[in-house]
Structure formats: structure tokens, C-alpha cells
């Protein structure tokens, strides 16, 4: 019994005066607490308590469940205890089978003994299975068996408390350990699509997948820069132990333009947090935006190829595409394809392949595209660069020499005079008149230029050269002059191709 100095309050004394007492089942438990300031007896087993205000605790017929710690407390709050074992061969263990362990922490298997004199108090696996090799435990007959540093691998471990009694192994009821994993990484989050484009009134639905070791992971959909509560629905699965998946689906049944923005799926556990975002754009109606990939004014040399290429954004999907020239629709020579195979792709490419273009094939080429909401078009003005062609070269009745040339770009006509037998005509002659004539062909056809000089200026035999040229090439025509007396005659004009 405790002893204290005189004058100080002393703890109560208990009879019988021992720390442990063993009684047989059916026998009487009689405990006396002596203290002038007696307050109460408290009985505790498996962390449950009962109180008694009588200073003598009497249990006439002891049962195994009367095993436990009996504590007498006085008015000064001082106490004294005795532990009573009620030996019952038919009930060697008192149990509370709730058994949870936090990974890396200790946990108590609550199976206190009713008989402290049994031996080999330990844990055993169910159905004769061995315990994990690294499982360490510390037995305490009054509390149970403490498993040290619970491992994740112990989850759903089935075990019994065990003792040897009279040479036989006796097992308690079965315990199943439920391990709560420690979070050792942030949750893994992913989203069904990174961006959404909708028309007003359409349903917006996006799913976030959260993966972690347990369902204790927290997740939510948040709208960036907003505190508005979002409506979510959940599905969850345990793919075996410590492999938990949750799908959080956010739905806006009828999206409005002002619902546009960034939505974040956020998840956290005690280790940290992770998030992923998706962008919603809601438009009041569909659209088509066309972007030419080349200049809409195109110059191409005669006989060469050119590709007219557009990219366009279309939402909803494009339904009709066509290329048109001179009110005629191309049935081939063009292709249309999505810019990417991504499910949320709204960008497309259309290419018209023009091959070996002739001078007569210049003009406006138009790409038209439509969807259920809008139509859009873009025009390319194609100019075919052609070497000048001399259409006419004549001596007119009024004595003028006239040269008419066609080509694109607009040809320039220069005149040269070659006296006598000289091969090279270098002396230039200024024209009297130069006119650009209206072509009867399409507006993108060749340009016709007419130039005239006065032949009376020539006093000697020789050759007059009319040279038409542009960026593409040049062509010449010649007038030969011979004088007979005072008369000048034009003898056979001829052209000479000059590359």
C-alpha cells in the first residue's frame, strides 16, 4: 500500500492489499476501499468503465467479464487500483474485435486474458497460416497484444490471440486487421478532356479521375476565381487494396456564355495536393473562321503548279465544303481533312491542287464551307504569268508601224532600228503612241498592249524590231525596210522568239 508524509492527503487503501487478484469463475469478488474521503469505485476493462459509489465492491458470482482494473478514488482525486482476473477455462480472452491500424504506427489487438498464469501469450495466423515474418508484437495480459509498426501488407490480415493452457493451444475469436494507409504521394488526377467548346443550351459534362491509396482522399471541382458551389456526381471503385479510383463528374445541364472559363479538379491528402484543369468555351452560336495559308493574291508562271491552302475553325463540325472557279465546282483536285485527330479538334485544312496552269486559267478560286449554323467563304485571285505573245505587227496606211502584244504581267514594248546588215538592233526608237487595250477575256487574263512608231523617221535600209517583254520572257517581231528610189517598202515582217 502507498505511504505518504503526515499532513498530506493520502490515497485510499484497498483490501485485499495486492496489485493483482485471481479468482475463479463463480466465486465472490469482495473489494474494500478505506478512505475518510471515499468517492467512488471505477471498474475498467477493454477501455469501458463502470462506477460504484459504495466503498465495498461486491460481485457475488464472478464472471470472466468481471476481469479488469478496479480503482478507488477519494475526494482529493487520489486513487489506488487492483487488477482482478476471473479465471474461466471456457473464456480465456475478453475481446473487442474492432482492429484498425495506421500504416507505420502501432495498434492494439484487444484480447486481455482472464488467467495470467497461462503461457505463450501471442498472436497466430488464421487457419494455421504463419504471420508475416516482419510482424513484431508485445503481449500485455491486461490490455492485449500490441502490433508494432503496422505495414500496408498486413491489411486484412486474419489473426487470433493465442495461449497455451495445460499443454494445448487455445485461440481467441478471429480478428481482421484493417490497415489505413499513410499517404506517401499526392493523388493522381486526370481529366476526360482538356477543353470543351459548346453552343448555348448544350450540356457540359466533364469527368475527373482521382487515384489514391484510399477513399480518404478529398476531391472537388472548383471554378477558377469563383466560390460558386458546383454540382458533382461520384462513382468510385476499389481495385484491390490501396488502389482506389473515384470519378467526379461535373455537369452543367444547359451551358450559358457566362459559364465559359477554367474549371479545376483539385484533390488532396495528408501528403499534398494535385490538380488538373479543363477549359470551357460557350458560344452563343456556331462559327467558322477561315485562315489562308498562302497570300490570297497568287502569281504563278504558265505551266507551273500551285496549291491553294486554307485552314479553318468550324464549330459545330463542317458539313459542306467546296472549291469553285468560274461558277464551276471542282469534283476532284482537292482534299479536306481535320488538322488533328484529337476528339476536341475544331481546326481543318482544305487544299486545292492546281496543276500545269494555263494563261487562260487565272481568275478567282473560292473556297466555301458551311455547318449547321453559318456559311463562310474565302477567295483567291490567281494570276498566271505568261510570256508576251505578239498578236499583230502591221504597217498602217498612215505609215505607222504598229505592234500589239499580250501577256501577264502587262508587257512593255520597245522599238529598235538596225541599219543595213547589222545583226544587233540597239538604237532605240521612241514610240508615238502606247495604249493598254481592254481584253475581251476574263479579268485575270493576259493584258494587251498596243504600241506605234512613225516609219517616216527611217531613211535607210534596215530592220525595225518590236520587242515585247515582261517578268516571264520576251518576244520580238521584225519589219524589214528596203528603199527603191524614193519609195520605202515594208518587206516581209517576221517574228523571232527570244527566250
Amino acid at each position: 500500500q502507498p505511504s505518504v508524509s503526515p499532513g498530506e492527503p493520502s490515497p485510499p487503501s484497498i483490501h485485499p492489499g495486492k496489485s493483482d487478484l485471481i479468482v475463479r469463475v463463480g466465486d465472490e469478488i469482495r473489494l474494500l476501499c478505506t478512505d475518510p474521503g471515499f468517492v467512488k469505485w471505477t471498474f475498467e476493462i477493454l477501455d469501458e468503465t463502470n462506477e460504484n459509489k459504495q466503498n465495498e465492491w461486491i460481485t457475488e458470482k464472478a464472471e470472466a467479464t468481471n476481469t479488469g482494473k478496479y480503482t478507488c478514488t477519494n475526494k482529493h482525486g487520489l486513487s489506488n487500483s487492483i487488477y482482478v482476473f476471473v479465471r474461466d477455462p471456457a473464456k480465456l480472452f475478453l475481446v473487442d474485435r474492432s482492429l484498425y491500424g495506421k500504416e507505420d504506427n502501432d495498434t492494439l489487438v484487444r484480447c486481455p486474458l482472464t488467467d495470467p498464469e497461462v503461457t505463450n501469450y501471442s498472436l497466430k495466423g488464421c487457419q494455421g497460416k504463419p504471420l508475416p515474418k516482419d510482424l513484431r508484437f508485445i503481449p500485455d495480459p491486461k490490455a492485449g497484444i500490441m502490433i508494432k509498426s503496422v505495414k500496408r501488407a498486413y491489411h486484412r490480415l486474419c489473426l487470433h490471440c493465442s495461449v497455451d493452457q495445460e499443454g494445448k493451444s487455445v485461440l481467441s475469436e478471429k480478428f481482421i486487421l484493417k490497415v489505413r494507409p499513410a499517404f506517401k504521394a499526392v493523388p493522381v488526377v486526370s481529366v476526360s478532356k482538356a477543353s470543351y467548346l459548346l453552343r448555348e443550351g448544350e450540356e457540359f459534362t466533364v469527368t475527373c479521375t482521382i487515384k489514391d491509396v484510399s477513399s480518404s482522399v478529398y476531391s472537388t471541382w472548383k471554378r477558377e476565381n469563383s466560390q460558386t458551389k458546383l454540382q458533382e456526381k461520384y462513382n468510385s471503385w476499389h481495385h484491390g487494396d490501396f488502389n482506389y479510383e473515384r470519378q467526379a463528374t461535373l455537369t452543367i445541364s444547359s451551358a450559358r456564355v457566362n459559364d465559359s472559363g477554367v474549371f479545376m479538379c483539385y484533390a488532396n491528402n495528408t501528403f499534398g495536393s494535385a490538380n488538373v484543369t479543363t477549359t470551357l468555351e460557350v458560344v452563343d452560336k456556331g462559327f467558322i473562321n477561315i485562315f489562308p495559308m498562302i497570300n490570297t493574291t497568287v502569281f504563278v508562271n504558265d505551266g507551273e503548279n500551285v496549291d491553294l491552302i486554307v485552314e479553318y475553325e468550324a464549330f459545330p463540325k463542317p458539313e459542306h465544303q467546296q472549291w469553285i472557279y468560274m461558277n464551276r465546282t471542282f469534283t476532284d483536285k482537292w482534299e479536306d481533312y481535320p488538322k488533328s485527330e484529337n476528339e476536341s479538334n475544331i481546326r481543318y485544312v482544305s487544299e486545292l491542287h492546281l496543276t500545269r496552269l494555263k494563261g487562260t486559267e487565272g481568275g478567282t478560286y473560292t473556297f466555301l464551307v458551311s455547318n449547321s449554323d453559318v456559311n463562310a467563304a474565302i477567295a483567291f485571285n490567281v494570276y498566271v504569268n505568261t510570256k508576251p505573245e505578239i498578236l499583230t505587227y502591221d504597217r498602217l496606211v498612215n505609215g505607222m508601224l504598229q505592234c500589239v502584244a499580250a501577256g501577264f504581267p502587262e508587257p512593255t514594248i520597245d522599238w529598235y532600228f538596225c541599219p543595213g546588215t547589222e545583226q544587233r538592233c540597239s538604237a532605240s526608237v521612241l514610240p508615238v503612241d502606247v495604249q493598254t487595250l481592254n481584253s475581251s477575256g476574263p479579268p485575270f487574263g493576259k493584258l494587251v498592249v498596243q504600241s506605234s512608231i512613225d516609219s517616216s523617221a527611217f531613211k535607210h535600209n534596215g530592220t525595225v524590231e518590236c520587242k515585247a517583254y515582261n517578268d516571264v520572257g520576251k518576244t520580238s517581231a521584225y519589219f524589214n525596210f528596203a528603199f527603191k528610189g524614193n519609195n520605202k517598202e515594208q518587206i516581209h515582217p517576221h517574228t523571232l522568239f527570244t527566250p
Epitope: 463502470n50 504506427n105 478471429k174
Partner: antibody, heavy 117, light 111 residues
Framework: QVQLVQSGAEVKKPGASVKVSCKAS????????MHWVRQAPGQGLEWMGV????????SYNQKFKGRVTMTTDTSTSTAYMELRSLTSDDTAVYYC??????????WGQGTLVTVSA | EIVLTQSPSSLSASVGDRVTITCRAS??????????MHWYQQKPGKAPKLLIY???NLESGVPSRFSGSGSGTDFTLTISSLQPEDFATYYC?????????FGQGTKLEIK
């Protein structure tokens, strides 16, 4: 003997928070898990979550996602359940329940929370 | 989550009748042959009261006319001879894995 005594009825406005208490006696408070269960009028029982014995870590039903917090005060052997951003759907009787030997062996008497504008 | 479906949802019976309520789980609630299924009784305005734990164990203080059976996904609560005080709502509950779930309830009424 084990007893769980809960705080009295509450009337709250939508958007407000409520904190229900559950005072335990008759056992070592820190040795047992405490669960919270609610029951809407005329409806069934719904598990909200648990605060585990020992270290006091929690596990919540995802349905209450971030709106619920369960805590304990070991000095007074009291468990608390706070629910935020209340709506009319949160009108219910809220129960605390002690887990003993794998089952909910002891229940509080319940706390009616009414959410009304 | 594990979904528990009780049948019937309501039931009319007379004093002395034998009554059976079933609870079906969407997946097994067993671990090593132990069924983490429990039955509760609830009367209007009162907290639920535990009747049967771990599928077939009678809670201390509960009359022996109550019994439970089953394993895996199919469970039964039986009242062998109905007494007037047994008219109440009965719930099954699983705690094999979180979130713990309850059946929707079976209301037992006097015929």
C-alpha cells in the same frame, strides 16, 4: 455504462454552418472510433464519416466533400461534427455512434438540424 | 461503394408471425469468412439499436427471437415470433469497406 449525449436541436439558414457535439462517458474516449450518421426526415440512415481512435485521423464519405469536419476534444471526451454550406437537403437528425467490437454498439440520442430560410 | 438492397421495403404482419427480411450486397462483405454485416432496429424518434452483429451474433440484451444468417452477398434477419414491440424499421449495414453503407430500410407494420 457507456453514454453518448448530443447537443440540442439547431435551426440554421442556408449557407450557414452547424457544429454538433457528442459527449462520451463510460469508456476511455481515445480508445474507440466515433462515427457520424445522419437521417433525413422519412429517409434511411447515411454514414458521414469516422474519426479514428488514437491519432484522430478521419475518413469522410465523399458525398460530404469538404463540407464536413470531425474533431475531438479529449480533455472533455467530446466529439464534434461540423457541416458547412448548409442547404435544405441537410435537414436531418445527426447521430454519433461508437464503434465497439466491429459494430455501432452505442448511439447518441440524435440532434435535429433544420435548415430553413 | 457497396450498395445494400433490402426487401421488402415494407411488410405487414401480425403478432406471433415469423418474419424474414433480406439484405443483398452489391459485392461480398466477407473477409476470411467473417461477414461484416449488422442489423439495427429503429423506432420513430429514437436512435437505431443494434440487434445482430457480424451477420449472426445476437447483441447482448436482445431477445433470442431475433436471429441473423447469411454470408457473402445475401443476408437474412428473422424474427421467429413477432411481439408488439417489434413493429419498427430495420436496417442492414456493412462495414467491410468505406464508405460504410446502410440498406434503405424495411418498415414492419401491424396488419
Amino acid at each position: 455504462q457507456v453514454q453518448l449525449v448530443q447537443s440540442g436541436a439547431e435551426v440554421k439558414k442556408p449557407g450557414a454552418s452547424v457544429k454538433v457535439s457528442c459527449k462520451a462517458s463510460g469508456y476511455t474516449f481515445t480508445s474507440y472510433n466515433m462515427h457520424w450518421v445522419r437521417q433525413a426526415p422519412g429517409q434511411g440512415l447515411e454514414w458521414m464519416g469516422v474519426i479514428y481512435s488514437g491519432q484522430g485521423d478521419t475518413s469522410y464519405n465523399q458525398k460530404f466533400k469538404g463540407r464536413v469536419t470531425m474533431t475531438t476534444d479529449t480533455s472533455t471526451s467530446t466529439a464534434y461534427m461540423e457541416l458547412r454550406s448548409l442547404t435544405s437537403d441537410d435537414t436531418a437528425v445527426y447521430y454519433c455512434a461508437r464503434e465497439r467490437d466491429t459494430r455501432f454498439g452505442n448511439w447518441g440520442q440524435g440532434t435535429l438540424v433544420t435548415v430553413s430560410a | 461503394e457497396i450498395v445494400l438492397t433490402q426487401s421488402p421495403s415494407s411488410l405487414s404482419a401480425s403478432v406471433g408471425d415469423r418474419v424474414t427480411i433480406t439484405c443483398r450486397a452489391s459485392e461480398s462483405v466477407d473477409i476470411y469468412g467473417e461477414s461484416f454485416m449488422h442489423w439495427y432496429q429503429q423506432k420513430p424518434g429514437k436512435a437505431p439499436k443494434l440487434l445482430i452483429y457480424l451477420a449472426s451474433n445476437l447483441e447482448s440484451g436482445v431477445p433470442s427471437r431475433f436471429s441473423g444468417s447469411g454470408s457473402g452477398t445475401d443476408f437474412t434477419l428473422t424474427i421467429s415470433s413477432l411481439q408488439p414491440e417489434d413493429f419498427a424499421t430495420y436496417y442492414c449495414q456493412q462495414n467491410r469497406e468505406e464508405p460504410y453503407t446502410f440498406g434503405q430500410g424495411t418498415k414492419l407494420e401491424i396488419k
